[in-house]
Interface confidence: medium
């Protein structure tokens, strides 16, 4: 709305940088062939690039990434009882970000 | 995968708490009747609850919220020239979070 301007602070752009995000660990990251298990923890923190750039034709993208293996519990349900095993999930952390030109593909003539 | 366990650190649960997220300011928050304008800044930071809880039947939810009005630029294009106006967008910040029981509705019999 255009009303109640007095109390409003000027909006500050969310700059393009890494922020902490929550990554849900889906079961198919661990085992695509079997659905009879649970994963713990169900979510972890990752570093991801987010925010906006000063120009419409650029996007905030990761300029440096790092793969980070973490150990999770794979809780298999065998005959209605759990068996705890370990599994490794590889997370992607963004270490640095940049505002990168978005190349829109030209239509083929 | 169950391989390469040695190098992997144990995964740590992303606890239920407020984190900084990026909120995209969509044009229809400002004017639903007109698409002939731009908004600046296009995105801002907000505080939002995220993460996981220790129990299956609970979800991370905001237990305290605050509405925060911010002033943005509405850049209207009038006869191919920009006209700058002010507009207020009300953002929702989460101040506190809690793991709240999810009540799954029972089927009506």
């Amino acid at each position: 709305s255009l009303g109640s301007l007095a109390a409003a602070e000027p909006a500050v752009i969310a700059e393009c940088k890494t922020r902490t995000e929550v990554f849900q660990i889906s079961r198919n990251l661990i085992d695509r062939t079997n659905a009879n298990f649970l994963v713990w923890p169900p979510c972890v923190e990752v570093q991801r690039c987010s925010g906006c750039c000063n120009n419409r034709n650029v996007q905030c993208r990761a300029s440096q990434v790092q793969m980070r293996p973490v150990q999770v519990r794979k809780i298999e349900i065998v005959r209605k009882k759990p068996v705890f095993k370990k599994a490794t999930v590889t997370l992607e952390d963004h270490l640095a970000c940049k505002c990168e030109t978005v190349v829109t593909p030209r239509p083929v003539t | 995968s169950l391989g390469s366990l040695a190098a992997a650190e144990p995964a740590v649960i992303a606890e239920c708490k407020t984190r900084t997220e990026v909120f995209q300011i969509s044009r229809n928050l400002i004017d639903r009747t007109n698409a002939n304008f731009l908004v600046w800044p296009p995105c801002v930071e907000v505080q939002r609850c995220s993460g996981c809880c220790n129990n299956r039947n609970v979800q991370c939810r905001a237990s305290q919220v605050q509405m925060r009005p911010v002033q943005v630029r509405k850049i209207e294009i009038v006869r191919k020239k920009p006209v700058f106006k002010k507009a207020t967008v009300t953002l929702e910040d989460h101040l506190a979070c809690k793991c709240e029981t999810v009540v799954t509705p029972r089927p009506v019999t």
Epitope: V78, P82, V83, F84 | N55, R56
Partner: antibody, heavy 120, light 107 residues
């Protein structure tokens, strides 16, 4: 204060029954899985039984299967172990212990234990 | 049934490093926890999930687990560390404890 307090131990004859209780306080009992662990005099720890947060999952060591029953009353913040057909080899200190998650995991909080003696 | 094997006793001089082993078939595939028990007291968790220390446990306690063996390491052992130590793993539908190791701190 976060604690577990066991009660109900004592002297019982072989073939007899006993019901142990474990009162939890200082934490949200209904969010945690629980176990009973026992220790015979001068011996090591032996896991006895487990129950999930909501009581839907229960399992037992082979040595007590069919004789012991684990249960919980989340409204009373209490864990139970019903022990029937007791034998001399069941003589031990019985500890209740808390798992940090609904599915189990390590035992991060233990009670002080209650002694069960099976003897004629 | 699954078994975890520990040495019955380990001796160490004060200030030295004590290592207590725990072995089991493919133990590295499971999460191992370690408990300390002093005479007349309930056990206390000192290491969980192979190598994590609960709050309040001194930094001198550490753990590792790979292959068929998990190890509890106590660096700069102190007299107060004298106790029984038990490894534990949740494997096939049951929590299994090792037989326990009596750690003696030589005077």
């Amino acid at each position: 204060e976060v604690q577990l307090v066991e009660s109900g131990g004592g002297l019982v004859q072989p073939g007899g029954s006993l019901r142990l209780s474990c009162a939890a306080s200082g934490f949200t009992f209904s969010s945690y899985a629980m176990s009973w662990v026992r220790q015979a005099p001068g011996k090591g720890l032996e896991w006895v039984s487990y129950i999930s947060d909501d009581g839907s999952l229960k399992y037992y060591a082979d040595s007590v299967k069919g004789r012991f029953t684990i249960s919980r009353d989340n409204s009373k913040n209490t864990l139970y172990l019903q022990m029937n057909s007791l034998r001399a080899e069941d003589t031990a200190v019985y500890y209740c212990a808390r798992h940090p998650y609904w599915y189990g995991g390590q035992l991060d909080l233990w009670g002080q234990g209650t002694l069960v003696t099976v003897s004629s | 049934s699954y078994e975890l094997t520990q040495p019955p006793s380990v001796s160490v001089a004060p200030g030295q490093t004590a290592r207590i082993s725990c072995s089991g078939d493919s133990l590295g595939s499971y999460f191992v926890h370690w408990y300390q028990q002093k005479p007349g007291q309930a056990p206390v968790l000192v290491i969980y999930d192979d190598s994590n220390r609960p709050s309040g446990i001194p930094e001198r306690f550490s753990g590792s687990n790979s292959g068929n063996t998990a190890t509890l390491t106590i660096s700069g052992t102190q007299a107060e560390d004298e106790a029984d130590y038990y490894c534990s793993a949740f494997t096939h539908n049951s929590d299994v404890f090792g037989g326990g190791t009596k750690l003696t701190v030589l005077q």
